[in-house]
């Protein structure tokens, strides 16, 4: 026999859910134990079945989830999943805030990503901080050269998608470049989008050869410049 435990605690790290009105919210508390535990939900400490909620709720016990569609300000509160079996119980609190302000294009923090200089063989991190009412999606792009040209006939740059991610609002998104070589030098773009539109900012990575005399032994592996 075993008391309940969280099977995917990394999926529960986002405690505060700040969601625009009209959106769908999903809380999950994936758990296991022996015997198989049951899950129930509380709102602000009271048993929550959604009977007073317009549109009700969806409880998917096999997914350990609570789903509320078209959230409104009255849905704000603390939602607790209570998982229990004969051996013991565990609980986790989610905080829901329903936002009513005007959703806007993603806003990228000025100066990020930052122009960076690194030595061949070192590791580089490019940062992008996004502020968005709606959940943003991010792409990291590298500007590339095709047939000796950086731009197509339409005047737009050639880009290669390096990474795509859906992130939580106000998270820092990082592009890791390991063991950089001269070929990694160039322009990198952080592109953030939501249902309203896209925003993007770029930075240049300069890669210096290992034996470059201007690079002192005491210098850090990667240097960030504006």
């Amino acid at each position: 026999q075993q008391a309940p435990y969280w099977t995917h605690p990394q999926r529960m790290e986002k405690k505060l859910h700040a969601v625009p009105a009209g959106n769908t919210v999903k809380f999950r508390c994936p758990a296991a134990g022996n015997p198989t535990p049951t899950i129930r939900w509380l709102k602000d400490g009271q048993a929550f079945h959604g009977e007073n909620r317009i549109g009700g709720i969806r409880l998917r016990h096999q997914h350990w989830s609570l789903v509320m569609e078209s959230v409104v300000p009255s849905d704000r509160g603390t939602y607790t999943c209570l998982v229990e079996n004969a051996v013991g119980s565990i609980r986790y609190n989610y905080l829901l805030d329903v936002l009513e302000r005007s959703p806007h294009r993603p806003i990228l923090q000025a100066g990020l990503p930052a122009n960076t200089t690194a030595v061949v063989g070192s590791d580089v991190e490019l940062l992008c901080k996004v502020y968005s009412d709606a959940q943003p999606h991010i792409q990291w792009l590298k500007h590339i050269v095709i047939n000796g040209s950086s731009f197509g006939a339409d005047g737009f740059p050639y880009v290669q998608v390096l990474k795509t991610a859906d992130i939580n609002s106000s998270e820092v998104e990082v592009l890791y470049l390991r063991n950089v070589s001269a070929e990694d030098a160039g322009e990198y773009t952080c592109l953030a989008g939501n249902s309203i539109g896209l925003s993007y900012q770029s930075a240049w990575l300069t890669v210096l050869p290992e034996e470059d005399p201007t690079w002192t032994a005491a210098a850090p592996e990667a240097r960030y410049t504006d």
């Epitope: 625009p20 009209g22 959106n23 769908t24 078209s70 005007s102 959703p103 806007h104 294009r105 806003i107 990228l108 000025a110 709606a134 959940q135 999606h137 792409q139 792009l141 339409d154 737009f156 740059p157 880009v159 998608v161 795509t164 773009t189 592109l191 989008g193 939501n194 249902s195 309203i196 539109g197 896209l198 925003s199 993007y200 900012q201």
Partner: antibody, heavy 124, light 112 residues
């Protein structure tokens, strides 16, 4: 060819419901946010609602909030607008409009492709 | 909500002559990424709006170079350098920076 084709318009009495559809073709529908915009007879343009590429985010104009629901079926390349509790002032041509995509914007990031529109008349 | 105010209401232009339409927003449309999110459309009789200019001054593909957009922050202008008969229609500006997206009231362009 990139195309949006609206359907479902018609004449309906105040208080009743109507469901509009928009069939998309010629582009990867599931990668784009989608909007509805309407235009009352002889009047200007009014934005109605938007839905994100995956349906997880929806926003509405105050004038339709609580009455209209925007939804999408990416497996069928279809955008919908469920209109309940219709009012006389909802009478308009309803346009389906492509919004922002998920990738690098080779041109405008949305509001470039409009459907031909479908007419909704709310009258007793 | 951002209010978009367009002037004039209507414009009667001789073919070959220039035309200018103004649009003012109640808040700045200059975004943190350095772009100004004002769009211009023309709507011809019985048709949906057609995009002319995006992000203040970029001509959409297929739009003749006699159309140009300019301005900054809250004041925007659409210019037609030499009006042609096919330019007849109602012109709208739109802000595309936040929801609700809002349009100007329209400017009707006719040929003298």
């Amino acid at each position: 060819e990139v195309q949006l084709l609206e359907s479902g318009g018609g004449v309906v009495q105040p208080g009743r419901s109507l469901r509009l559809s928009c069939a998309a073709s010629g582009f990867t529908f599931s990668s784009y946010a989608m909007h509805w915009v309407r235009q009352a007879p002889g009047k200007g343009l009014e934005w109605v609602a938007v839905i994100s590429y995956d349906g997880s985010n929806k926003y509405y104009a105050d004038s339709v909030k609580g009455r209209f629901t925007i939804s999408r079926d990416n497996s069928k390349n279809t955008l919908s607008l469920q209109m309940n509790s219709l009012r006389v002032e909802d009478t308009a041509i309803y346009y389906c409009v492509r919004g922002a995509g998920r990738g690098y914007p080779y041109g405008p990031d949305g509001f470039d492709i409009w459907g031909q529109g479908t007419m909704v008349t709310v009258s007793s | 909500d951002i209010v978009m105010t367009q002037t004039p209401l209507s414009l009667s232009v001789t073919p070959g002559q220039p035309a200018s339409i103004s649009c003012r927003s109640s808040r700045s449309l200059l975004h943190s990424d350095g772009k100004t999110y004002v769009y211009w459309y023309v709507q011809k009789s019985g048709q949906p709006p057609q995009l002319l200019i995006y992000e203040l001054s970029n001509r959409f593909s297929g739009v003749p170079d006699r159309f140009s957009g300019s301005g900054s922050r809250t004041d925007f202008t659409l210019k037609i350098s030499r009006v042609e008969a096919e330019d007849v229609g109602v012109y709208y500006c739109m802000q595309y920076i936040e929801a609700p997206l809002t349009f100007g009231g329209g400017t009707k362009v006719e040929i003298k």
